[in-house]
Amino acid sequence: SGPVKELVGSVGGAVTFPLKSKVKQVDSIVWTFNTTPLVTIQPEGGTIIVTQNRNRERVDFPDGGYSLKLSKLKKNDSGIYYVGIYSSSLQQPSTQEYVLHVYEHLSKPKVTMGLQSNKNGTCVTNLTCCMEHGEEDVIYTWKALGQAANESHNGSILPISWRWGESDMTFICVARNPVSRNFSSPILARKLCEGAADDPDSSMV
């Protein structure tokens, strides 16, 4: 019985739970998901039972062995998977545990602007990047393009300080999770700060 294997899948995609068995005379293999039986295989009996009908179209054995492939993944497929290999040649079953995390493909992140001020010809504000549907395990980074050196900033909030007369800058939020990444629409510093340009001491949301 090896250490827990961590697997990652994407909604609509597929994942294979790898199983290499050295057991010679296998009586049965039982795959379970969160303690619910998923598949039972009795190799010599020629028996393959997929416990729930809704999984019959999603289960496969891809490598000519006992590895399990689960396709058309859904968010609620995330959880603990467990396989037991039972054999009269073993005093106790050979087991392996897996943890599956299923993530959604990220949609375009949304950017909101915080309170904006324009003092002494410098536009100061915060840009906040977020996912509209509250997806899990999202990491945000910002790319600032247009100055001598392109810059990166980690985190969902980007503090901006842009002086009128400087070359224009473009800000892009990059949202990442373990299965995908997506980009916000580019935001131009000049456009962003135009609202505060008329009044050098104004602040706006």
């Epitope: 009586d27 295989i41 028996t47 393959i48 496969d60 054995f61």
Partner: antibody, heavy 117, light 107 residues
Framework: EQQVVESGGGLVQPGGSLRLSCAVS????????VIWVRQAPGKGLEYVSI???????YYASSVKGRFTISRDTRLNTVYLQMNSLRAEDTAVYFC???????????WGQGTLVTVSS | DQQLTQSPSSLSASVGDRVTITCRAS??????LSWYQQKPGKAPKLLIY???NLASGVPSRFSGSRSGTDYTLTISSLQPEDFATYYC?????????FGQGTKVEIK
Amino acid sequence: EQQVVESGGGLVQPGGSLRLSCAVSGFSLNSYGVIWVRQAPGKGLEYVSIIGSSGNTYYASSVKGRFTISRDTRLNTVYLQMNSLRAEDTAVYFCARYYGDSGFDSWGQGTLVTVSS
Amino acid sequence: DQQLTQSPSSLSASVGDRVTITCRASQSIGSWLSWYQQKPGKAPKLLIYGASNLASGVPSRFSGSRSGTDYTLTISSLQPEDFATYYCLGASPNGWAFGQGTKVEIK
């Protein structure tokens, strides 16, 4: 070389019993499973029962409760005890070695069982 | 319910023809499928095991493949000795199951 020979077939009345034998040589029953398959006259092949290498037994639903598969590893023989026989059990009965990977590689020539009054 | 659906039930072909026989499983059975040739009055003979592995002593014109739950036996160039009935055998929820058989006859 692996060899498989069936015996014990014959004519039996409906409701009667018969025991078929499958004598194997060239391999050990502790290492390989043995399957029984039958073929009614002019029909296709039908799975009947299998005994695994560790002695586990499995049956087709059509014979479950009426047929019993067993083995004697010292005599290298697999048996199929058939009780409550019906006319539809009339067939040539084959036994074969389970090679693994769903393959049955050594077959006997078959023994004919006729259930008739 | 039929666990393995074999098609066609019969076909006529000539020597040298390419012949394809298909077996469809009612659910995924991985590679737990084999193919057999049977001649009248004889025992079945193993051709392919594990869906695509050629059995010992079987000519290379026989091959097996799998696509999802569809399994195919192909005879690349039919020979006179290949006229016979072919069966698939596979795993199922109820244990081993045979296809209905395909009789390959001379055209």
